[in-house]
């Protein structure tokens, strides 16, 4: 039994970290390897990680942590019984990917305006709660080709647009997800997405 | 709420023996590290000893290594000091204090007192 | 003789900034994160700042923390009165395998 593609791991700067990595053939991760985990610290000590299956031969772990700050460091032991496969290291600061933001609402009864909110995915006292930025993503259900990004670099968790700058009498979905550049992170996921009926009329011309 | 209480503290004379407790409530007490830090009357915070989640590591300050040791009984939420052959410049206010990363939670001390 | 070396005592009036330093030997190393506790008078000491500059929730932020190699620092802005109090800062030290406190800075709030 070997590692194909070493673990990579990222971590959402919270609570969880996740490492994926490959083995060289079929492998059923959960019962055949241990993924052990210790912060480099005087009293820590090591905490196993069971891997779930992740494809064949693909297996994916999410290593708990209590928090985390910018200069922890972990050791990384892929164990399958007694056979040590691969040994490293993960700074979870280095490599981060922010949790998706929730709760997406778009708000239709402002006269000419869409009020897209969400939530911020981090506590306030959580480093990247006043460094994200978002993306939303906007489509047409019907129309492929009406699909548009907005790029929100501001910290509230809200977009407006106005009502006219999408077709009127379709359906639409919109999602964001979040990055924070400062922490020189990777995109989050984006959020489930959320439907509603784009029906502004244009006003009456006055003649 | 995290709670930290100490007891045991009294007075004691040179070369005697002491046992300090702690009981923690308010927290997983089974998954942290914890530490005993003393204070000397009128002078600065001093480390004494540590012990890791499980008891498996354990540390202690020169000052008292080899007459002082640590335990814990995670299934009682409690911390212990074992302190022999006690001398005068043990006397102090004992804290037991949670450690993450750092000391992040004490308790309100217990004081000892070494004297003939 | 502690380690890590602070002034004993330090002043300031209320509103101002002050700041604590904290210095390790030369030979200190410097791998490990500083940690700052606060003492008010008759009390149990309290984490301030952790990880060289990371509060812990309920500390306010008018108290900063920060580290250059083998020292560190610690800053208070807006200073009240109700901060007079003994300052302490703190590392693990791999190489003696323990705790190293700093001898502790008394703050006093002048007016």
């Known amino acids: 039994m070997k590692v194909l593609q070493e673990p990579t791991c990222v971590s959402d700067y919270m609570s969880i970290s996740t490492c994926e990595w490959k083995m060289n053939g079929p492998t059923n991760c959960s019962t055949e390897l241990r993924l052990l985990y210790q912060l480099v610290f005087l009293l820590s000590e090591a905490h196993t990680c069971i891997p779930e299956n992740n494809g064949g031969a693909g297996c994916v772990c999410h290593l708990l942590m209590d928090d985390v700050v910018s200069a922890d460091n972990y050791t990384l032991d892929l164990w399958a019984g007694q056979q040590l496969l691969w040994k490293g290291s993960f700074k979870p600061s280095e490599h981060v990917k922010p949790r998706a933001p929730g709760n997406l609402t778009v708000h239709t009864n402002v006269s000419d305006t869409l009020l897209l909110t969400w939530s911020n995915p981090y506590p306030p006292d959580n480093y990247l709660y006043n460094h994200l930025t978002y993306a939303v993503n906007i489509w047409s259900e019907n129309d492929p080709a009406d699909f548009r990004i907005y790029n929100v670099t501001y910290l509230e968790p809200s977009l407006r647009i106005a009502a006219s700058t999408l077709k009127s009498g379709i359906s639409y979905r919109a999602r964001v997800r979040a990055w924070a550049q400062c922490a020189n992170t990777t995109w989050s996921e984006w959020s489930p997405s959320t439907k509603w009926h784009n029906s502004y009329r244009e006003p009456f011309e006055q003649h | 709420e995290v709670q930290l209480l100490e007891s045991g503290g009294g007075l004691v004379q040179p070369g005697g023996s002491l046992r300090l407790s702690c009981a923690a409530s308010g927290f997983t007490f089974s998954r942290h590290a914890m530490a005993w830090v003393r204070q000397a009357p009128g002078k600065g915070l001093e480390w004494v000893s540590a012990i890791t989640s499980s008891g498996r590591s354990i540390y202690y300050a020169d000052s008292v290594k080899g007459r002082f040791t640590i335990s814990r009984d995670n299934s009682k939420n409690t911390l212990y000091l074992q302190m022999n052959s006690l001398r005068a410049e043990d006397t102090a206010v004992y804290y037991c204090a949670r450690v993450h990363r750092a000391f992040d939670y004490w308790g309100q001390g217990t004081l000892v007192t070494v004297s003939s | 003789q502690s380690v890590l070396t602070q002034p004993p005592s330090a002043s300031g009036t209320p509103g101002q900034r002050v700041t604590i330093s904290c210095s390790g030997s030369?030979?200190?190393?410097?791998?490990?994160?500083f940690n700052w506790y606060q003492q008010l008078p008759g009390t149990a000491p309290k984490l301030l700042i952790y990880a060289d500059s990371h509060r812990p929730s309920g500390v306010p932020d008018r108290f900063s923390g920060s580290k250059s190699g083998t020292s560190a620092s610690l800053a208070i802005s807006g200073l009240r009165s109700e901060d007079e109090a003994d300052y302490y800062c703190g590392t693990w030290d791999y190489s003696l395998s323990g705790y190293v406190l700093g001898g502790g800075t008394k703050l006093t709030v002048l007016g």
């Open positions: 030369p030979l200190f190393p410097d791998s490990g994160s």
